[in-house]
Amino acid sequence: NKILVKQSPMLVAYDNAVNLSCKYSYNLFSREFRASLHKGLDSAVEVCVVYGNYSQQLQVYSKTGFNCDGKLGNESVTFYLQNLYVNQTDIYFCKIEVMYPPPYLDNEKSNGTIIHVKGKHLCPSPLFPGPSKP
């Protein structure tokens, strides 16, 4: 028995940031799970990991340097990615593993999401800089 995953076919990352929602045919409430996002056709790069184990708080990390955060819905995990580069335009796959309660479950490979990272437009500097921030 496999979990099915739905993703948007394509997203455009303006300002080098994007939100990618992974929707599952499984309710993650009160489950111990590991949701992850993988880059490339071969899913070789694990971009971000979101770990949930019953508590309200998700544990988020990346072993590949990506700046990410995660948000949990009943049947979804949304990955928030920041500081993406144009050359990180690629296909990204959602993966889910449910560790507890038994049985262990994971997903059928999804169709993935092509994330197109748009470069920042280089505008001429204003005559007067905007207000500084603390």
């Epitope: 979101v50 309200q56 708080q57 998700l58 544990q59 988020v60 990390y61 990346s62 340097g65 990506f66 700046n67 990410c68 955060d69 995660g70 948000k71 949990l72 920041q82 500081n83 580069y85 921030k133 603390p134």
Partner: antibody, heavy 120, light 107 residues
Amino acid sequence: EVQLVESGGGLVQPGGSLRLSCAASGFTFSSYWMHWVRQAPGKGLMWVSRINSDGSSASHAESVRGRFTISRDNAKNTLYLQLNGLRAEDTAVYYCARADSSTWYEFDFWGQGALVTVSS
Amino acid sequence: EIVLTQSPATLSLSPGERATLSCRASQSVSSYLAWYQQKPGQAPRLLIYDASKRATGIPARFSGSGSGTDFTLTISSLEPEDFAVYYCQQRNNWPPTFGQGTKVEIK
């Protein structure tokens, strides 16, 4: 005026536990990511943990993952760090720091720090 | 993780002189680099963010420049209160990392 005041530091034996608190005032606490950054005696700065604005997600440096837990109480404008399984190398001044929820890891205000000493 | 290397480790200068501090990243951090000042017994204070933008209340004698892997903090004319340790920090990649610091001391 933005203020961050840490408390809860002290001397603890290896393997022991401690809970640090950071009381925030002068800004809308629930709108900001919050962090803990530490500084070993005479050393540089090292990021330890972060929590997002509503407390629903957290991240920890690899060296403390599984031992330290960050949490917050937005009703009390307070940030916490639970330190378990303490080691000598965790001895440091622990600072809480604020970050805008759009920049995530840019620390615009810091507390004065709480000293944690791990020694037998 | 990204390693930030600051140089020199110590800078001995007199008040009124110009200070130039360097921070080099092991890989590109775009312009997501900040500079902090720390005085003995005090918390760090944000001086510069996004490589070149001054934080609120920071005097104009502090300026930052650079992008990619090479960054510079310049203090145009040192005031007595500027003698401190300065740290760079990147937020482009996770985890955020700091340089080891440059101490600016009175000659």
